[in-house]
């Protein structure tokens, strides 16, 4: 004999207390597949979480983060505080990027400026806390007629070894 529970559709649960009736999920719960013997409790988007998609009888709620925070982890399992560009989040809060590093987003860490000299290039635009350096053409590219780009400043840019 076929198990009657296997035919209970999504949005219901097979209620053994009630002679295996396919009972609609109670408030604030859902079943996303058929044949369930219980409904799962809906996720509640509280505090720094806010509701991106309401829970329905067949699907869980989805959360994102309130302004000033951003999602981390699968399904936005955590909210992390935003920082300004040029900062990174530490245990003590948002801190400015150290000299020689930058962060052009409101999240994540400060990363070292690109070392142009590793590619045999020169620094065209200096780096800041918010922006990486812009590497210019290599000195070899600056032979007459090769380029009309203004030569870079002397190669004692902050955070870079002399070329």
């Amino acid at each position: 004999l076929q198990d009657p529970c296997s035919n209970c559709p999504a949005g219901t649960f097979c209620d053994n207390n009630r002679n295996q009736i396919c009972s609609p999920c109670p408030p604030n719960s859902f079943s996303s597949a058929g044949g369930q013997r219980t409904c799962d409790i809906c996720r509640q988007c509280k505090g720094v979480f806010r509701t991106r998609k309401e829970c329905s009888s067949t699907s869980n709620a989805e959360c994102d983060c309130t302004p000033g925070f951003h999602c981390l982890g699968a399904g936005c399992s955590m909210c992390e505080q935003d920082c300004k560009q040029g900062q990174e989040l530490t245990k003590k809060g948002c801190k400015d990027c150290c000299f020689g590093t930058f962060n052009d987003q409101k999240r994540g860490i400060c990363r070292p400026w690109t070392n142009c000299s590793l590619d045999g290039k020169s620094v065209l635009v200096n780096g800041t806390k918010e922006r990486d350096v812009v590497c210019g053409p290599s000195p070899a590219d600056l032979s007459p007629g090769a380029s009309s780009v203004t030569p870079p400043a002397p190669a004692r840019e902050p955070g870079h070894s002399p070329q």
Epitope: C8, N19, C22, S23, P24
Partner: antibody, heavy 118, light 112 residues
Framework: QVQLAQSGAEVKKPGASVKVSCKAS????????MHWVRQAPGQRLEWMGW????????KYSQEFQGRVTITRDTSASTAYMELSSLRSEDMAVYYC???????????WGQGTLVTVSS | DIVMTQSPLSLPVTPGEPASISCRSS???????????LGWHLQKPGQSPQLLIY???YRASGVPDRFSGSGSGTDFTLKISRVEAEDVGVYYC?????????FGGGTKVEIK
């Protein structure tokens, strides 16, 4: 919107059978159990049985066991309740009701009056 | 069978005044999932019953917030904070927990 439209009034002789239909619209018919309830004049509501969601297996009140048959036609989104061996005490208004919330009949048909008279 | 007992049988009310109906069950209606399986329906004159409250205290969609349900286990109450003329009819409690599902005998609410 959800609607349950029942068949019209019936007059039957004692010993006969009656089959009441309940056509559902505005929702996925197979996703919710359908119950049948009757109300004799001046009496409380009396539950008769249900047709479950999914494959539509049935459960009946012991009071009507052997006399009532609840069926459904999913393709026509219609539930049926047949009561046999009618007697005068079966004269009542018969309702279909959807269990659309947990343990709750959120929509009812308009009722079908069945008169049993010789 | 679970026997549902309602009181009072009749309740004359004054519009604007509160009203309260009691329902007792012969067995606990608390499901293993933590919800009380008790519903309240109103049957207005000449109409089909309509759902007011389910799972003891949850108001059905479109039901005015002057209606509230409370209680747990075997003792339940339906309260109307301020009765309006349209609230007249017979109120039934119902248990959908065990077969057979059973209804209370009804409470007739009428305007004084």
């Amino acid at each position: 919107q959800v609607q349950l439209a029942q068949s019209g009034a019936e007059v039957k002789k004692p010993g006969a059978s009656v089959k009441v239909s309940c056509k559902a619209s505005g929702y996925t018919f197979s996703s919710f159990p359908m119950h049948w309830v009757r109300q004799a004049p001046g009496q409380r509501l009396e539950w008769m049985g249900w047709s479950n969601a999914g494959i539509g297996n049935t459960k009946y009140s012991q009071e009507f066991q052997g006399r009532v048959t609840i069926t459904r036609d999913t393709s026509a989104s219609t539930a049926y309740m047949e009561l046999s061996s009618l007697r005068s005490e079966d004269m009542a208004v018969y309702y279909c009701a959807r269990e659309g919330l947990t343990g709750a009949f959120d929509y009812w048909g308009q009722g079908t009056l069945v008169t049993v008279s010789s | 069978d679970i026997v549902m007992t309602q009181s009072p049988l009749s309740l004359p009310v004054t519009p604007g005044e509160p009203a309260s109906i009691s329902c007792r069950s012969s067995q606990s209606l608390l499901h293993s999932n933590g919800y009380n399986y008790l519903g309240w329906h109103l049957q207005k004159p000449g109409q089909s019953p309509q759902l007011l409250i389910y799972l003891g205290s949850y108001r059905a969609s479109g039901v005015p917030d002057r209606f509230s349900g409370s209680g747990s286990g075997t003792d339940f109450t339906l309260k109307i904070s301020r009765v309006e003329a349209e609230d007249v009819g017979v109120y039934y409690c119902m248990q959908p927990l065990q077969i057979p599902l059973t209804f209370g005998g009804g409470t007739k609410v009428e305007i004084k």
